[in-house]
């Protein structure tokens, strides 16, 4: 499911519950995705010892995964709500191609991988409603994404395992950073 239980507007199981605010819905959606990533990481970590490797050992890769930096305005120091929101949405849009790559990379967690992908699409929609400056958000080029996907899928098994691990870890860190920032807004 792309939305956490109880989030769907058609959910009538708890009629007396206060409807969630936009911020609460975004917060809950991120936590839901993080739970999904955690489940996927369990499968990848059981299959290889990459999760034990230090970040330095895995730093040498040519993946251009989105990462928060001071200039993005999402840290406590130099916090800027609008700049940060643009970075979060742009970063999530950039992660979409990597989430597409994760599909078919899992045996026992195939549905979970799909749920993470679909939930991220929903999260992007939630955030776009919150953003005032949508013009500043750059959407990745579909042709570039298609060739990147082909390139990633053509890697040998070891590199595909490594890529899967790095995507999950980077996406987790990006979402955690986003959540910390959104909770300051």
């Amino acid at each position: 499911a792309p939305v956490p239980p109880g989030e769907d507007s058609k959910d009538v199981a708890a009629p007396h519950r206060q409807p969630l605010t936009s911020s609460e819905r975004i917060d809950k959606q991120i936590r839901y995705i993080l739970d999904g990533i955690s489940a996927l990481r369990k499968e990848t970590c059981n299959k290889s010892n990459m999760c034990e490797s230090s970040k330095e050992a895995l730093a040498e890769n040519n993946l251009n995964l989105p990462k928060m930096a001071e200039k993005d305005g999402c840290f406590q120091s130099g916090f800027n709500e609008e700049t940060c929101l643009v970075k979060i949405i742009t970063g999530l849009l950039e992660f979409e191609v990597y989430l597409e790559y994760l599909q078919n990379r899992f045996e026992s967690s195939e549905e979970q991988a799909r749920a993470v992908q679909m939930s991220t699409k929903v999260l992007i929609q939630f955030l776009q409603k919150k953003a005032k400056n949508l013009d500043a958000i750059t959407t990745p080029d579909p042709t570039t994404n298609a060739s990147l996907l082909t390139k990633l899928q053509a890697q040998n098994q070891w590199l595909q395992d490594m890529t899967t691990h790095l995507i999950l870890r980077s996406f987790k860190e990006f979402l955690q950073s986003s959540l910390r920032a959104l909770r300051q807004m």
Epitope: L34, S38, S54, K55, A69, Q76, E173, S177, R180, R183
Partner: antibody, heavy 116, light 110 residues
């Protein structure tokens, strides 16, 4: 395990750097926080370092305390120290697997005394 | 800014007693609350996280409950080893706060 070092007797105004060193694991995979405890008082959170460059500090610590990180150590730089900063300083590890901060491994603490 | 208020600040109890400590957050923190035990001269030890999940190796006589703003730590049957100071800590947001920890509750022998 975690071990703090660098605590000593200093005079007011002296800068001081405390170091938290990990044994048996790489700190690069974890968040690290600093907490202090004045004699006979409660725990007081100072700040946390997430990745290599994202930090957060208690309101009273901003500008006077700085946390930085390598793969094996995390430093706490303190400036403009006063007698009120006299405390045992602890570093603690957050396994960073979830979104909420919780500190599941602690060092034994290092004592900082500020006195003229 | 989120503030954590713990009560009582101290209590006296006997071995075998049921002990309850409460912690209140100034705004909703979901279930993102941890409890720690500290003995004199020692580092704090994580007891409970996510309001009710027991940390590894913690005896089952410890339990936690609550969500939103009100939380409780319960020791079902106090043991000699449990006389210590207990702290709650919010893990919801560590930005723009004075302290992540509550003031502490000292559990003493009656």
């Amino acid at each position: 395990s975690l071990e703090e070092s660098g605590g000593r007797l200093v005079t007011p105004g002296t800068p001081l750097t405390l170091t938290c060193t990990a044994s048996g694991f790489s700190l690069s995979n974890y968040y690290v926080t600093w907490v202090r405890q004045a004699p006979g008082k409660g725990l007081e959170w100072i700040g946390i370092i997430y990745g290599s460059d994202e930090t957060a500090y208690a309101t009273w610590a901003i500008g006077r305390f700085t946390i930085s990180k390598t793969s094996t150590t995390v430093d706490l730089k303190m400036t403009s120290l006063t007698a009120a900063d006299t405390a045992t300083y602890f570093c603690a590890r957050d396994d960073s697997s979830d979104w909420d901060a919780k500190f599941n491994l602690w060092g034994q603490g290092t004592l900082v005394t500020v006195s003229s | 800014a989120i503030q954590m208020t713990q009560s009582p600040s101290s209590l006296s109890a006997s071995v075998g007693d049921r002990v309850t400590i409460t912690c209140q957050a100034s705004q909703s923190i979901n279930n993102e609350l941890s409890w720690y035990q500290q003995k004199p001269g020692k580092a704090p030890k994580l007891l409970i996280y996510r309001a009710s999940t027991l940390a590894s190796g913690v005896p089952s006589r410890f339990s936690g409950s609550g969500s939103g703003t009100d939380f409780t730590l319960t020791i079902s049957s106090l043991q000699p080893d449990d006389f210590a100071t207990y702290y709650c800590q919010q893990g919801y947001s560590l930005r723009n706060i004075d302290n992540a920890f509550g003031g502490g509750t000292k559990v003493e022998i009656k």
